[in-house]
């Protein structure tokens, strides 16, 4: 007789990451009876919503439902119908919406209200949409990567089941780069966290963690570029901006009104004698790097040491996972290998930025020109942020691991967020249960 497979006793969860440049929907799955075990939740699907981030819909909020449809439909297809009503859906909005809220709380609320109404129409258990804080974004990213790396598990293994595992319980730091903000989160070594705003205390699986975190609003790659342009146009003699962060031969017209639309450029705003200016790329890494460094104020620090802009940063400790745009940009530039030294990365960036725009366009025909044109800036920015901003060195560079996925799940804040909201990370170590047959490999 044919063995009939028993119905899987599994649960699902959905988290939407409403970022500044796009929205992604993640579907997670786990065995129902192992909710409190570490490492059992895994991602089964990512659906990237086609289009921009939700903050761009501020003038046409009635269309947010249309925008979200395809990925929500995908979730309906992936998750068995019998599970729909008990599958929680969470939406967390990050720095793009934080910036919109700074401009107008009313507009931000209107966007979130329409998001909530749209998501409530689906057959899932919608749990709400909110703007998460930068501190949460950092903390949940840290939880995600350490959960996936098995750092919260008390069982020591003689073999490694995940990449980067050093077979110890020392947690990884988390480096997250978005379009509008960037987060740094790690456990410092026996160091007091001098600023209370940057201190987090967790008890996870029976162990206490004192975690440092900071989110730099306006220092995501897209907002950093707007800042740089606003800073540089101040000293341009006319409406031509010769920019070392773009490839030679690249040209783009920018509206001054667009430049000053974001709160991130307010500190550089001035009355200009023109409504538009033209970026003309000259492709020079060194000059680009110098220009970026001017965005980091390192002249003032009220603590024993700072990152930049007077923000406390303890001495770096241990290994770090660098994900989101840190990974996407470095992956595009083919610089994610563990073997590539910081000197080699700098060398490669010099060559890449110097390549003529026409040559770049031909080499990367399938890449959207807006994104393609910005890789020189983004790569240079990543180096500047990590080296001068966070004080990594040529030696400590090897402790940075550019990570896209761990065990098939994307590195990012969404998994940590869901684990927290579904109470799947216990404070105490769960009582160990006898191994079931399925535990044996």
């Amino acid at each position: 007789t044919q063995n009939k497979a028993l119905p899987e006793n599994v649960k699902y969860g959905i988290v939407l990451d409403a970022g500044s440049s796009h929205t992604s929907l993640y579907i997670y799955k786990w065995p129902a009876e192992k909710e409190n075990d570490t490492g059992v939740v895994h991602q089964v699907e990512e659906c990237r919503v086609k289009g921009p981030g939700i903050s761009k819909f501020v003038q046409k909020v009635n269309e947010i439902g249309i925008y979200l449809t395809d990925c929500m439909e995908r979730a309906r297809e992936v998750i068995p119908r019998s599970q729909h009503q008990e599958t929680p859906v969470y939406l967390g909005a990050t720095a793009g919406m934080r910036l919109l809220r700074m401009e107008s709380e009313e507009l931000a609320d209107r966007v979130l209200d329409v998001v909530e109404r749209s998501l409530s129409n689906y057959p899932f258990d919608f749990q709400g949409a909110r703007i998460i804080t930068g501190q949460e974004e950092g903390a949940y990213g840290w939880i995600t990567i350490n959960y996936l790396l098995g750092k919260f598990s008390q069982k020591t293994r003689w073999f490694s089941i995940v990449p980067y595992e050093t077979n110890n319980q020392e947690t990884f730091g988390a480096l997250d780069l978005g379009g509008a903000s960037t987060q740094v989160t790690f456990v410092p070594q026996n160091q007091t966290i001098e600023s209370p705003d940057n201190a987090l205390q967790f008890r996870l699986y029976g162990k206490d963690y004192n975690v440092y975190t900071h989110s730099f609003l306006c220092y995501g790659k897209d907002q950093a570029l707007w800042q740089k342009l606003a800073k540089d146009i101040q000293v341009a003699s006319n409406e031509i901006l010769r920019d070392p962060c773009f490839h030679p031969g690249y040209k783009k017209v920018v509206n001054v009104s667009d430049l000053y639309k974001t709160p991130c450029t307010k500190r550089f705003e001035m009355t200009l004698p023109f409504q538009q200016f033209e970026i003309q790329g000259i492709g020079n890494y060194q000059q680009c790097h110098q220009s970026i460094l001017e965005l980091f104020n390192t002249s003032y620090c009220p603590y024993s040491q700072c990152a930049f802009n007077g923000i406390f940063l303890p001495p770096l400790q241990g290994d770090f996972g660098a994900f989101s745009a840190f990974y996407f940009v470095m992956k595009f530039l083919n610089l994610t290998s563990e073997k590539v030294s910081q000197e080699k990365v700098t060398e490669m960036m010099k060559k890449f930025c110097a390549q003529p725009w026409e040559e770049i366009k031909t080499s990367y025909a399938g890449v959207k020109e807006k994104y393609l044109s910005e890789y020189c800036f983004s790569g240079t920015y990543i180096l500047s942020l990590l080296l001068q901003g966070y004080h990594f060195t040529a030696d400590s560079w090897e402790h940075i691991h550019f990570i896209g996925k761990i065990q098939g799940s994307d590195a990012g804040w969404t998994l940590g967020y869901m684990l927290n909201l579904t109470n799947m990370i216990p404070a105490e170590q769960p009582l160990s249960t006898p191994l079931s047959h399925s535990t044996y490999v």
């Epitope: 921009p52 269309e63 925008y67 109404r117 959207k368 994104y371």
Partner: antibody, heavy 121, light 111 residues
């Protein structure tokens, strides 16, 4: 600036197969869905199917299942429509189309110029 | 499959007047609070062009004289005031569920 360039007209014999292409410039096909639409001479429009080039998920009108295959190559920014076991009923103009939201939340649509397929012995 | 029936099959309207084209679906094309009905214009020898998406939203660069309305099973496209350039075929399309289907088309001519 965005253009969809479709391959040239095809004259093929019944029973044969053909592969039509649609190449985008100034836009990444990964950022939207690519749809294929059939229009027979002096007739209306028929939706064949669509592909999400980012993850190669495809959806078809069941009527074209087995007849049409939609694929995409993101490195060359090209989508393909392969039609098999051709008959005179497949004689038509085939359009590729992209529609969706751009970076500023404007809803766009881009269409190829159409490829004329003639099936005749 | 959802069947879309357009009426009239052809229509002649004077310059400056209002042209109204109807589209009826065999079942509701509403879902999640959205009406998944689109309207396209096609001129001879050219590909179609999106005019209206989700029943009432104007496509990029579409003149304000084109408007769409309706929900559930009954939809209409209005053109007012009619211009010479508007003579074309007009198609409705539902995108609520696969297979997406088109109406049979309405030929709009100048009177």
């Amino acid at each position: 600036q965005v253009q969809l360039k479709q391959s040239g007209a095809e004259l093929v014999k019944p029973g044969a197969s053909v592969k039509l292409s649609c190449t985008a410039s100034g836009f990444s096909i990964k950022d939207t869905y690519v749809h294929w639409v059939k229009q027979r001479p002096e007739q209306g429009l028929e939706w064949i199917g669509k592909i999400d080039p980012a993850n190669v998920n495809t959806k078809f009108d069941p009527k074209f299942q087995g007849k049409a295959t939609i694929t995409a190559d993101t490195s060359s920014n090209t989508a393909y429509l392969q039609l098999s076991s051709l008959t005179s009923e497949d004689t038509a103009v085939y359009y590729c189309a992209l529609y969706g939201y751009d970076d500023d939340a404007y809803y766009f649509d881009y269409w190829g110029q159409g490829t004329t397929l003639t099936v005749s012995s | 499959n959802i069947v879309l029936t357009q009426s009239p099959a052809s229509l002649a309207v004077s310059l400056g007047q209002r042209a109204t084209i109807s589209c009826r679906a065999s079942e509701s094309v509403d879902n999640y609070g959205i009406s998944f009905m689109n309207w396209f214009q096609q001129k001879p020898g050219q590909p179609p062009k999106l005019l209206i998406y989700a029943a009432s939203n104007q496509g990029s660069g579409v003149p304000a004289r084109f408007s769409g309305s309706g929900s559930g099973t009954d939809f209409s496209l209005n053109i007012h005031p009619l211009e010479e350039d508007d003579t074309a075929m007009y198609f409705c399309q539902q995108s609520k569920e696969v297979p997406y289907t088109f109406g049979g088309g309405t030929k709009l001519e100048l009177k």
